[in-house]
């Protein structure tokens, strides 16, 4: 039967009606409306926007729209005592100071409440000392410094360029290396694409532009003071000394004009190789300290930011399902921005708004989805995914029993080249089938499908004729749903050409220059890429909420499990002697993957054949599909990361943005050759193989015939 018959509605209310109702002009209008003033988490302006969205979603026709508030730890600069960095001479006089704010973009000079660049949750402090340049401050950069170059960062202020990995990992690495302060800067090599002008004449980062961002290492905890539980009115809060994930050393971000002044004087060791050189006209010497003439000069940080428990507001909209109201498909994206949020998040929020409007239009005409759809406008994402995590903590029992899928909706664009999708393998076939039905917006692909342009521009490295779909990592609001609760999740946006543009993210990310004009002038003047992303996100939600049989293919999980098992085995086999000595075997894991593959295949056969008119059997099969993702959750979590509970995927321990497969085994094997107790280390590898093998086998059994 078609989904139309299932929900007893007229045939015109199908996916096509939903997609046809989505309009680029509306997305453009919504984006403009959401970006005229800053909407920093915890501010009155963001509360007012929450109420506006609540009101508009009600007008659009949702059954209910509520605000869900929490009191969480946020961080702000001191308005009267600005943060900055100085070069000081031997007398302690400040001979150079970094900028106090970014030059405002044209037309925004009189806007109040633009938060100056800062590293959210930096402790206060005024450390002074010699500078060490640590490249991207990745794990491997500190290995190079400490092990190969014998450079000690203890008691030094380190300067690291943004890019490659999440900034919180950079700070954690610097702390572990003994640094007493961290300066983060945007190098033109990473944030200035050749042949493009700086904003406002193009989409590149000007020298005075600075990337804001939090520097937490929460590992999925949510509010640092209430890990595991919602930050509600009767919450018990930890003391600040016991808070989760806070950095212990001062951190501050700067632009490349200021970085030039710090780096041009660097002395000490030369850069180890060309991968440590950026694009500034400086030597990229590692240090420590300044060169000859300037050797008596030091760097001093002045950080006065404060951490404050502040109220935040999520907007939660409900469109009740007609047949299975107790099954939830969630579309969520954040609303809070660092400044204007032209791309992050409002290009996503505008798309969500238009999706809600389209669903509302269908509902007003008598249609309802089969399953309940929840729409969320999350707060305080920029401060550590706080709004989504607190709401999920508050509603975890409902979500783990009723959550079918979560589709994330942050920035709709980070470029205008092709589609980018990260999702659970369960959604691969859904994404493939949907994109085959959508028109490509790309030049040169007129009349062709989105699937075709996407596959041509971003081919799968493994399967010819298919597009690349990546693993979910973190750094966005799907984290709690996927990594903690085991709800099938996905995200989609338009991206840049990674082949030709090797800069990290997009140049104006988290700067004051992320404006409506940036999008309207340079990225998507016709809003055709935004519309395509709306069709992909909205189409996924429509199918997940409306198809009679859930559009999940468990066979795709079997394929990737084999791939991930092969990969982790090959990593382990770099140590053949130790594997022999400590009797390390992957047989149990490969056996579990084989069993999973066979059981998934049989389940898929039954899925084709069963009587879909029998509501009990239909519900039973759908529940097996819904709970498959849940079956990969280990209630004990990963070592030292209790809120990362998915055994197949976790954010990389070295880069929160990246996903790692079989993360428990991967982390146990990482740098194992340097462990002081090899027997203990290889014992942990064996334990992690056991956990992974058991989990895969247990997940497979959830797909077996029930009796």
């Amino acid at each position: 039967k078609s989904s139309n018959e299932a929900t007893n509605i007229t045939p015109k209310h199908n996916m096509k009606a939903f997609l046809d109702e989505l309009k680029a002009e509306n997305i453009k209008k919504f984006l403009y409306n959401f970006t005229q003033i800053p909407h920093l988490a915890g501010t009155e302006q963001n509360f007012q926007l929450a109420k506006q969205i609540q009101s508009q979603w009600k007008e659009f026709g949702l059954d209910s729209v509520e605000l869900a508030h929490y009191d969480v730890l946020l961080s702000y600069p001191n308005k009267t005592h600005p943060n900055y960095i100085s070069i000081i001479n031997e007398d302690g006089n400040e001979i150079f100071n970094t900028s106090l704010f970014e030059p405002p973009p044209p037309g925004y000079e009189n806007v109040s409440d633009i938060v100056p660049p800062f590293s959210a949750f930096s402790p206060q402090g005024m450390p002074e000392g010699d500078l060490v340049y640590v490249n991207y401050a990745r794990t491997e950069d500190f290995f190079k410094l400490e092990r190969d170059m014998k450079i000690n960062c203890s008691g030094k202020i380190v300067i690291a360029r943004y890019g490659k990995v999440f900034r919180g990992n950079k700070v954690k690495n610097a702390q572990l290396a003994g640094a007493k302060g961290v300066i983060l800067y945007s190098d033109p090599a990473d944030y200035f694409a050749p042949g493009v002008k700086s904003y406002p004449d193009g989409w590149n980062l000007p020298g005075g532009g600075v990337q804001r961002g939090n520097i937490l290492n929460l590992n999925g905890a949510g509010d640092p003071l209430t890990p595991g539980y919602p930050a509600n009115e009767y919450a018990y809060r930890r003391g600040i000394a016991e808070a989760v994930g806070l950095p212990s050393i001062p951190v501050h971000p700067i632009g490349y004009y200021d970085a030039q002044k710090l780096l041009e004087k660097m002395g000490g060791s030369a850069p180890p190789d060309s991968s440590w050189r950026g694009s500034l006209k400086v030597p990229y010497n590692v240090g420590p300290g300044f060169t000859g003439n300037f050797s008596t000069q030091k760097v001093k940080m002045h950080i006065h930011s404060t951490n404050e428990v502040t109220r935040i507001y999520n907007v939660i909209g409900t469109l009740r399902g007609a047949v299975e109201p107790d099954r939830y498909v969630i579309l969520g994206g954040h609303r809070d921005s660092w400044v204007f949020g032209g791309i992050d998040p409002q290009s996503g929020a505008a798309v969500v708004h238009e999706i809600v409007r389209s669903f509302g239009t269908l509902k007003k005409e008598g249609w309802r989805p089969r399953r309940t759809i929840l729409f969320a406008s999350w707060d305080a994402e920029e401060f550590g995914l706080l709004g989504s995590t607190e709401w999920a903590e508050e509603n975890s029992r409902l979500l783990q029993e009723r959550g079918v899928a979560y589709i994330n909706a942050d920035s709709s664009i980070e470029g205008n080249y092709t589609l980018r999708v990260d999702c659970t393998p369960l959604m691969y076939s859904l994404v493939h089938n949907l994109t085959k039905e959508l028109k490509s917006p790309d030049e040169g692909f007129e009349g062709k499908s989105l699937y075709e342009s996407w596959t041509k521009k971003s081919p799968s490295p493994e399967f010819s004729g298919m597009p690349r779909i990546s693993k979910l990592g973190s750094g966005n609001d799907f984290e709690v749903f996927f990594q903690r609760l085991g709800i099938a999740s996905g995200r989609a946006r338009y991206t840049k050409n990674w082949e030709t543009n090797k800069f990290s993210g997009y140049p104006l990310y988290h700067s004051v220059y992320e404006t409506y004009e940036l999008v309207e002038k340079f990225y998507d003047p016709m809003f055709k890429y935004h519309l395509t992303v709306a069709q992909v996100r909205g189409g996924m939600v429509f199918e997940l909420a409306n198809s009679i049989v859930l559009p999940f293919d468990c066979r795709d999980y079997a394929v990737v499990l084999r791939k991930y098992a092969d990969k982790i085995y090959s990593i382990s086999m770099k140590h053949p002697q130790e594997m022999k000595t400590y009797s390390v075997s992957f047989d149990s894991l490969f056996s579990a993957v084989k069993n999973f593959t066979e059981i998934a295949s049989k389940f898929s056969e039954r899925l084709q054949d069963f009587d879909k008119s029998n509501p009990i059997v239909l519900r039973m099969m759908n529940d097996q599909l819904m709970f498959l993702e849940r079956a990969f959750i280990d209630p004990l979590g990963l070592p030292d990361r209790p809120f990362y509970r998915h055994v197949i995927y976790a954010p990389s321990s070295h880069n929160k943005y990246a996903g790692e497969s079989f993360p428990g085994i991967y982390d146990a094997l990482f740098d194992i050759e340097s462990k002081v107790d090899p027997s203990k280390a290889w014992g942990e590898v064996k334990r992690q193989i056991y956990v992974a093998a058991f989990t895969v086998q247990a997940a497979a059994e959830t797909l077996s015939e029930v009796a």
Epitope: F96, T98, P103, P104, P106, E109, G207
Partner: nanobody
Framework: QVQLVESGGGVVQPGRSLRLSCAAS????????MHWVRQAPGKGLEWVAF????????YYADSVKGRFTISRDNSKNTLYLQMNSLRAEDTAVYYC????????????????WGQGTMVTVSS
């Protein structure tokens, strides 16, 4: 259109003080570093002082260091030069000029000039 208008010049005795103003129009002062430059009678141009757009850094010619202070009020789109302990050799036409680099951190080239205001230091 983009312009700079200096005011506040005049005749003053040695050792006294004077404050020059420079009103900017047609562009936002808040985005630009600004300079004061002077030209003594029959002499070439001499750079006097520079302040970054955000007020975080000030640079001075050795000849005025400790006596002159450059400042700005971005909300009024106005640049100032407070001149204390004036000397006869400070006699000149004083020009304000806009630095050409938006958000620049050190003095660079000028791209817009005012018409100047005359300061005469004489007993």
């Amino acid at each position: 259109q983009v312009q700079l208008v200096e005011s506040g010049g005049g005749v003053v005795q040695p050792g006294r003080s004077l404050r020059l103003s420079c009103a900017a129009s047609g562009f936002p002062l808040i985005s630009y570093g600004m300079h004061w430059v002077r030209q003594a009678p029959g002499k070439g141009l001499e750079w006097v002082a520079f302040q970054t757009y955000d007020g975080s850094n000030r640079y001075y010619a050795d000849s005025v260091k400790g006596r002159f202070t450059i400042s700005r009020d971005n909300s009024k789109n106005t640049l100032y030069l407070q001149m204390n302990s004036l000397r006869a050799e400070d006699t000149a036409v004083y020009y304000c000029a806009r630095d050409r680099i938006v958000g620049g951190r050190v003095p660079d080239a000028f791209d817009i000039w005012g018409q100047g205001t005359m300061v005469t230091v004489s007993s």
